[in-house]
Every structure is written in structure tokens, then in C-alpha cells.
Interface confidence: medium
């Protein structure tokens, strides 16, 4: 999906009212020094293709991370604010709803969600200095 | 309305130094990045570096680590580049650019700096 | 770092004329783009950024798009006005890097 077509100021408003939030409260007893931040965005869209691909897209040691609030949060608000980007999913939740069915909070998540964290705060203000 | 008004034309001879300035308004200063942009006699345009208004953090390329440095007064909402040991090929017209995804929607008026003995 | 390699250098047209200048960057940049025009002694303005999308106030003459690496700025009708020099730019990352500039002028 193209993401440059996007509100970003309403995205940037949702985050900054509920997902951010939702986001420490999955973190909630874990360090912020405790994972490093490997995944980096350099503008809007590229923060958003990131996002969506940490968020939505099972990984080795984290399938679970689509039904979690934030994730929730985060596709009504894509949907939301960037034009077709429902149409492009269909298949993707299909592919969620195969996933597993209880949430299970491994290390592995831990780590994905801190790297979202961090993808999150770069499209709230484009950093900008890494490729 | 956005405005970004850089300082007038320099001519400074090599060895010397020269600040330029641009003066920003109708933004809140710290949103956008500051870059700097510089433009050789009938020559492109060359990305030379950026500064966070909101940290002063800078990024610039390797060729003019040694050249330039950028800073920022928040209080005037001003960015500063300032060339150090200035040389013919540094002769040029320098522009300010504000940035929030790396494309420049608004544009200093340039600044020309002669260097000549 | 992307190298942005913009052809031609240089073009003569005719007012009406439909006008198409490229830019092939070196690798992968998705839709991080941008075009200006650039007037004698005058400072840069931006025309498209995102690859297509076109900036305030820029006359829809204007477009761009987007096959892989290979961008394209059209003036689908030349105008008086469009007489200048044109960039492109991409914004994927640090270092932003310029494409050589294409000087479009009166045939």
C-alpha cells in the first residue's frame, strides 16, 4: 500500500491521543533501555509502511500482535485516513484471523513493540537522519 | 504566510569566515527542519547538511564536516550556517530550506558569498 | 549514497509542447521524490513531492509518476512561464541528493 496519500495529522492525532498510550500499557513493566531500536523510518509513509509491516505481519516468536488494542487502534485509524488502504487488507485479515487465537505476550513481542514505539514517535516528528 | 528572509550578499576574502543567516516566520520554528543548500555558479544544487530547530541536533555530509557548522536561535526563530576558511570554490549562492519529509516546500530568497582577494 | 541521474541535461520546446524529463536514482527510493523549478537568480520552488503529488498552487500541466526507479516530470502544455531549470530530489534519507538539473528553453 501507498501510504503518501495519507492524513498524517489525523494519524499523528490518533497516536498521540490512544495508540501511544495503549503501546505503554502492553510495555508496561519493561524497561525503555531494555531493547534497542534496529527499525528506522526516514518520513511519514516510510514510518507508516514500517508500522504497518511490525504491527500486522506475524513474526517468529510474535504472531499475536494484530488483536492487541494499539493494533486495533492503529488499523481503524489507517483505514480511516488513508484512502483504499481497506481494500488492500482483505486478504491480511484473513491471514489474522488464522493467526493464533489467545494473545501471549513473549520477549519477541516485547522487543516488536518497542521497536513500534519507537517507528511511532518518528512519524509523530520525522526524524529524518537515517536511511 | 511563511517567509523564510536570509541575510544580503557577503564578498570575504579566502581564509576568512562569513555567517548567513535565515530569519523564519508564520511557522512554529521548531516543527520543521532547517536544511542548507548550496548552489555553485551555473552549477546544481547540493544538499550540504540539516538542523533540528527543537535540540540543535546536525547532520552534514563529509565534505563539509570540517567547512561549516549550523546553528539555531529559537528565540529569534533564526538559522545560522556559518562557512570557516573560505576558498574560491567555496563562492556561491546559499539557500535555507524548512523540511518535514525531506522535500522543500518553502525556500530561503539564497544568499550569495564571494570569496575573492 | 543514491546517485539521481536526470536526463536530458538540456531541452529546446516550443510554447504547446508537451514536455517529459526522467530521473533514474540508483536504487530503491519508492515514491520519495521531488521536482522543482528553477528561475535565473531566483530560489527553487517546489512542484511535485511523493513522486506525483502536486504541491499548492502548482498547475495541474504539471504532473509526475513513477515506474520502479525511473521518475518522470510531464508539462503536458508548455507554457511561457515553464521556461527554467528543473530538479528532482530524493527524500528516502540522509543524504539528500539533486539530480543534475534539466534547462528546458525556447525552441
Known amino acids: 500500500y501507498d501510504f503518501t496519500n495519507c492524513d498524517f495529522e489525523k494519524i499523528k492525532a490518533a497516536y498521540l491521543s490512544t495508540i501511544s498510550k495503549d503501546l505503554i500499557t502492553y510495555m508496561s513493566g519493561t524497561k525503555s533501555t531494555e531493547f534497542n531500536n534496529t527499525v528506522s523510518c526516514s518520513n511519514r509513509p516510510h514510518c507508516l509502511t514500517e508500522i504497518q509491516s511490525l504491527t500486522f505481519n506475524p513474526t517468529a516468536g510474535c504472531a499475536s500482535l494484530a488483536k492487541e488494542m494499539f493494533a486495533m487502534k492503529t488499523k481503524a485509524a489507517l483505514a480511516i485516513w488513508c484512502p483504499g488502504y481497506s481494500e488492500t487488507q482483505i486478504n491480511a485479515t484473513q491471514a489474522m484471523k488464522k493467526a493464533r487465537k489467545s494473545k501471549v505476550t513473549t520477549n519477541k513481542c516485547l522487543e516488536q513493540v518497542s521497536q513500534l514505539q519507537g517507528l511511532w514517535r518518528r512519524f509523530n516528528r520525522p526524524l529524518l537522519k537515517q536511511q | 504566510e511563511v517567509q523564510l528572509v536570509q541575510s544580503g550578499a557577503e564578498v570575504k576574502k579566502p581564509g576568512a569566515s562569513v555567517k548567513v543567516s535565515c530569519k523564519a516566520s508564520?511557522?512554529?520554528?521548531?516543527?520543521?527542519?532547517m536544511h542548507w543548500v548550496k548552489q555553485a555558479p551555473g552549477q546544481g544544487l547540493e544538499w550540504m547538511g540539516m538542523?533540528?530547530?527543537?535540540?540543535?541536533?546536525?547532520t552534514l555530509i563529509q565534505k563539509f564536516k570540517d567547512k561549516v557548522t549550523m546553528t539555531v536561535d529559537k528565540s529569534t526563530s533564526t538559522a545560522y550556517m556559518e562557512l570557516s576558511s573560505l576558498r574560491s570554490e567555496d563562492t556561491a549562492v546559499y539557500y535555507c530550506?524548512?523540511?518535514?519529509?525531506?522535500?522543500?516546500?518553502?525556500w530561503g530568497q539564497g544568499t550569495t558569498v564571494t570569496v575573492s582577494s | 549514497d543514491i546517485q539521481m541521474t536526470q536526463s536530458p541535461s538540456s531541452l529546446s520546446a516550443s510554447v504547446g509542447d508537451r514536455v517529459t524529463i526522467t530521473c533514474r536514482a540508483s536504487?530503491?527510493?519508492?515514491?520519495?521524490l521531488a521536482w522543482y523549478q528553477q528561475k535565473p537568480g531566483k530560489a527553487p520552488k517546489l512542484l511535485v513531492y511523493f513522486a506525483k503529488t502536486l504541491a499548492e498552487g502548482v498547475p495541474s500541466r504539471f504532473s509526475g509518476s513513477v515506474s520502479g526507479t525511473d521518475f518522470t516530470l510531464t508539462i503536458s502544455s508548455l507554457q511561457p512561464e515553464d521556461f527554467a531549470t528543473y530538479y528532482c530530489q530524493h527524500h528516502y534519507g540522509t543524504p539528500w541528493t539533486f539530480g543534475g538539473g534539466t534547462k528546458v528553453e525556447i525552441k
Open positions: 508564520g511557522y512554529t520554528f521548531t516543527t520543521y527542519w
Open positions: 536504487e530503491n527510493i519508492y515514491s520519495y
Open positions: 530550506a524548512r523540511t518535514l519529509d525531506g522535500y522543500y516546500d518553502y
Open positions: 538542523i533540528d530547530p527543537s535540540d540543535s541536533e546536525t
